[in-house]
Structures are given as C-alpha cells and as structure tokens.
C-alpha cells in the first residue's frame, strides 16, 4: 500500500491529527521535500547575521553577515570580524602580517610570499604585507645587467574583496 503521506508536496506536511491530510506549513516553518511529517522551523538571521534570502514554505532562510564581518562555516553558520588587507585575525584582534608574509583579503591568514625559485623563476615584483610577490622569468631568461625586481605596486583598498 502506498503511504498517503507521499502525496504531500514540499511546503506542506502530513498531518497525523487530521487523518494524514496534507496541511500547509505554519508561518515561520518550511518543508523542502515532499512526504514530510513535520515542517522545520525557519532560521532567523539576528544580531551580526542579516537575511540574504527570506524563508518560504519550501525553503529555509539564508543568512549572511553585516558589513565588517564575513561568513564562516557551511551555510554561513558563523560571522567573523573582517581585518584590513595586510592583517590577520588573532585571539587579540587584527594584527599586521609579519615580514615575508601577506594577506590580500579582509579575511583569512597571512601567507608566506611565493617562493619564485621553487619554479625556477625570479622575483619580478617584491611582496608587501598586502600583496604577494609577482614571479617573473627564470634568471636565465633575463638579459645580462637587467634588473629583475620591480618595486611593489602601491597597496590600495579595496584589494581582494571579502567573499
């Protein structure tokens, strides 16, 4: 015998209290698949979270973060403070990248400058706190007496935007 609940579409639930008829999900709840016996409570985007997509009867709300913060975790389960380019977030707040490392985003960690010689290349543009080096041709490709290193381009906001 076919389960009568299997006929209940997304946006409804199979109501045991009413002879298993399909009832619409109550306000602030949803069911994203058919045949559900309950509707799920909608996520609420509060505090540092803001609503990216409203809850509907068939899909949950989606949150992102207020300006100055960025999402972490699946489905933006957390918001983390932005830092400036050239910094990383530590337990004590935003700290400048150490020499030889950079961060060209408002999130994430300071990473070591690329080691151009790993690929047999030279450094074309020096790194800064806000920018990685730019690797250039291999030293053998450079004409004798030619300088291989260009000073770094001036750092500018917004640089790599937070994702």
């Amino acid at each position: 015998l076919q389960d009568p609940c299997s006929n209940c579409p997304a946006g409804t639930f199979c109501d045991n209290n009413r002879n298993q008829i399909c009832s619409p999900c109550p306000p602030n709840s949803f069911s994203s698949a058919g045949g559900q016996r309950t509707c799920d409570i909608c996520r609420q985007c509060k505090g540092v979270f803001r609503t990216r997509k409203e809850c509907s009867s068939t899909s949950n709300a989606e949150c992102d973060c207020t300006p100055g913060f960025h999402c972490l975790g699946a489905g933006c389960s957390m918001c983390e403070q932005d830092c400036k380019q050239g910094q990383e977030l530590t337990k004590k707040g935003c700290k400048d990248c150490c020499f030889g490392t950079f961060n060209d985003q408002k999130r994430g960690i300071c990473r070591p400058w690329t080691n151009c010689s790993l690929d047999g290349k030279s450094v074309l543009v020096n790194g800064t706190k806000e920018r990685d080096v730019v690797c250039g041709p291999s030293p053998a490709d450079l004409s004798p007496g030619a300088s291989s290193v260009t000073p770094p381009a001036p750092a500018r906001e917004p640089g790599h935007s937070p994702q």
């Epitope: 060209d104 985003q105 994430g108 960690i109 990473r111 690329t114 080691n115 151009c116 790993l118 690929d119 290349k121 074309l124 543009v125 990685d132 080096v133 730019v134 690797c135 250039g136 381009a153 001036p154 500018r156 917004p158 640089g159 790599h160 935007s161 994702q163």
Partner: antibody, heavy 119, light 107 residues
Framework: QVQLVQSGAEVKKPGASVKVSCKAS????????INWVRQAPGQGLEWAGN????????NYNQKFKDKATITADKSTSTAYMELSSLRSEDTAVYYC????????????WGQGTTVTVSS | DIQMTQSPSSLSASVGDRVTITCQAS??????LNWYQQKPDKTVKLLIY???RARSGVPSRFSGSGSGTDFTFTISSLQPEDIATYFC?????????FGQGTKLEIK
C-alpha cells in the same frame, strides 16, 4: 612539465549534481592556487572560485557560492569542483587552472570539461 | 565586481598586419592585467602577465602595455597561427574578471 588533466564530458539531468576533477602533475600541488573558470556556449570566461590545496582555503565568486563546492585531495594532487542543483544554464565548459607563481594570473589550463544539462 | 571592457569584439586582419586590442577596467587595477589566447580547439594559454611581461616561449610579436585602467595588447605582425580569441583578465581584486573576448580572423 606542469600539467592539469580534467575528467571527461558529463551529461546530467536538471536537479542532479556533477563533480569535475582536475589532476595536477609536474609541480608541488600544495604550493599553488587552483582556479575554476566557466565558459558557457558562445560566451566569455567567468571565474568561479579557487582553492589553495595546502590548507584548502577557498574563495568563491558570489555568483557561484550556492552552486559550486571546490575541494582538493593532497594525496592524489587532484582538485574538484562539484556543481549542485544543475540547470540548463549550467551547461558549459569548466576549466581548472594553476597560478603563475602568485594568485594574480593563471599560467596553466586544463583541457576543459564539458558539462551538458538536459532533460 | 570590476568590469573589464574589451574592444573590439571581433576583427579581421591580414597576415603581417599590426593588431591592437584594448581593455578597460572599471577601477584602478595597477598592473594586475593578463592576456590569454583561446584557440579554436578551446585550449587556453597565458601570453602576457602583469600588463607587459611575456611568458617565456611566447613569440616576441605579442606585447602588452598600460597601467591603472587602460591596457593594450598588440600583435606586431599577424601570423596565420594567431587565429584565436583573446581575453584580458584582471588579477587585482576578487572575483577575478575577464573581458568579453576579441575574436581574431585572418582576411
């Protein structure tokens, strides 16, 4: 030499998912960013996102945030892009690329993987 | 997102001609501008990076120049094997963005 070899063409039904792979060789996989770029039929190139295989740090184009999941397996030097809830608009050639020695340019490109979404 | 406006969208030129393609960024991207060649078989190759640096092995007829928002890609003497579509791309700010492409044909 540096090479990126992608998985073969895929035909999928709307609503399905697909996982495209990109096997890297000829360099230290963990030291360079892998990018994914989409090209719809007759269209230009669109950057979807990238991953730094050393720590699996990812960046996404907001447009692909709910569509694509980029991962990397260091043990096999392979990067992946999984596309979910496929629609006809996702029909495209997907390329993986490797950076030139900092994230700002893409020096090596895979041969491309054609994903066709059709009922 | 940074918009990259590339022109022309297509052009037809004769072997030996000097060909110029321009790319304009919607905001300052310093020198983080790259040029790619996509052959009819869909293979893609980086030709020029950081505005004007040719990758090793790229013929000297290919060059690039510019800074800030306005950039130029030049083929000094067009060869039959240069039939391709050429794209500019900014690497300054995420998300990376490409120009619409210039399809180059031989007269």
């Amino acid at each position: 030499q540096v090479q990126l070899v992608q998985s073969g063409a895929e035909v999928k039904k709307p609503g399905a998912s697909v996982k495209v792979s990109c096997k890297a060789s000829g360099y230290t996989f963990t030291s360079y960013w892998i990018n994914w770029v989409r090209q719809a039929p007759g269209q230009g190139l669109e950057w979807a996102g990238n991953i730094y295989p050393s720590d699996s740090y990812t960046n996404y184009n907001q447009k692909f945030k709910d569509k694509a999941t980029i991962t990397a397996d260091k043990s096999t030097s392979t990067a992946y892009m999984e596309l979910s809830s496929l629609r006809s608009e996702d029909t495209a050639v997907y390329y993986c690329t490797r950076d030139y020695g900092s994230a700002y340019s893409m020096s090596t490109w895979g041969q491309g993987t054609t994903v066709t979404v059709s009922s | 997102d940074i918009q990259m406006t590339q022109s022309p969208s297509s052009l037809s030129a004769s072997v030996g001609d000097r060909v110029t393609i321009t790319c304009q960024a919607s905001q300052d991207i310093s020198n983080y501008l790259n040029w790619y060649q996509q052959k009819p078989d869909k293979t893609v190759k980086l030709l020029i990076y950081y505005t004007g640096r040719a990758r090793s092995g790229v013929p000297s007829r290919f060059s690039g120049s510019g800074s800030g928002t306005d950039f130029t890609f030049t083929i000094s003497s067009l060869q039959p094997e240069d039939i391709a579509t050429y794209f500019c791309q900014q690497g300054d700010t995420l998300p990376y963005t490409f120009g619409q492409g210039t399809k180059l044909e031989i007269k």
